[in-house]
Amino acid sequence: CDLPQTHSLGNRRALILLAQMGRISHFSCLKDRHDFGFPEEEFDGHQFQKAQAISVLHEMIQQTFNLFSTEDSSAAWEQSLLEKFSTELYQQLNDLEACVIQEVGVEETPLMNEDSILAVRKYFQRITLYLTEKKYSPCAWEVVRAEIMRSLSFSTNLQKRLRRKD
């Protein structure tokens, strides 16, 4: 499965939109910084078959989409930017879903993927727990925005490596 060129453009657009969504200085929120345990090893791309990598990317985008689709998120960000960001993520999910079906087959999800997917879910659970504990404060959302920018950058790099393998 070849991810369309528009997919990588969408990736870059999503990162630009997320950067634009920043409302307060990251420096004013340094005291709120937090380690969410991003599973970098799941995104280095070396030990992966393509189907595995696509499934992990899909989970990453899906969880990001879920995180920014909540009521609390709607209250935190400028609505038009949030909508554009969500639309980019939704398009990426469609591209990746088409690839998952092509690479893996409609019926089976390889069990070898599951541990990697669970690592991504665990990471997002820690993000949602942090937001809850911080009562969805502006600084908490800023910390999370910066964190998601970092994790989406890893996703973008993994996608680049996948294209080079093709």
Partner: antibody, heavy 122, light 107 residues
């Protein structure tokens, strides 16, 4: 096959320290939370604490915070529960459990160890 | 803490019967309800997760339903293996909490 194998029963005196273990196998250790659950004989289940083996990030039940501590050794895929000073009221069966996480981030306990009986008596 | 209250605390039934156990949460837990069975001298085992999903390998005579503050576990066509203690659990809020248990014994 996913397995959580716990150490055997322990008999201790009040004031003594103790560390019990849970050795896991059959999956990627760092991808799943592990919790400890207490069951006082003849009573119900109480969730104590959970740990992310990837970086030892922990979440405690406030009822147990300060009295027990959880830790992991990634090199031997083992989770520990430790007391520095046991009390008679710690007499119970302790289970280690693996969490599964759904896509909507719902936790549930899909695999349980066989349990370790800890008896504290003078 | 979210309190989980099971009813009844105990019940008697015969092989082949159907039984229903109810669990009430002190506040909404969405569908973060789970059910476990504990046989005497054994560790608990997962039966139902997220209120209504059957765990792999669990017979279809077990069904779960409900969401919000109440959920139910129904067991149809009771088998000898089913006489045990059943616990509900919520994982919506910390600390995670269990119901006090329902002991199902032979009439």
């Amino acid at each position: 096959e996913v397995q959580l194998v716990q150490a055997g029963a322990e008999v201790k005196a009040p004031g003594e320290s103790l560390r019990i273990s849970c050795k896991v196998s059959g999956y990627t250790f760092t991808s799943y939370w592990i919790s400890w659950v207490r069951q006082i004989p003849g009573k119900g289940l109480e969730w104590m604490v959970k740990i992310d083996p990837r970086d030892s990030y922990t979440i405690y039940n406030p009822s147990f915070q300060g009295h027990v501590s959880i830790s992991v050794d990634k090199s031997i895929t083992t989770v520990y529960l430790q007391w520095s000073s046991l009390q008679a009221s710690d007499t119970a069966i302790y289970y280690c459990v693996r969490h599964y996480l759904t896509q909507s981030l719902v936790d549930y306990f899909d695999h349980w160890g066989q349990g370790t009986l800890v008896a504290v008596s003078s | 803490d979210i309190q989980m209250t099971q009813s009844p605390s105990s019940l008697s039934a015969s092989v082949g019967d159907s039984v229903t156990i109810t669990c009430r949460a002190s506040q909404s837990v969405s569908n973060y309800f789970h059910w476990y069975r504990q046989k005497p001298g054994k560790a608990p085992e997962l039966l139902i997760y997220s209120a209504s999903n059957l765990q792999t390998g669990v017979p279809s005579r077990f069904t779960g339903s409900g969401s919000g503050t109440e959920c139910t576990l129904t067991i149809t066509s009771l088998q000898p293996d089913d006489f045990a203690t059943y616990y509900c659990q919520q994982t919506h809020g910390y600390p995670f909490t269990f119901g006090q248990g329902t002991k199902l014994d032979v009439r």
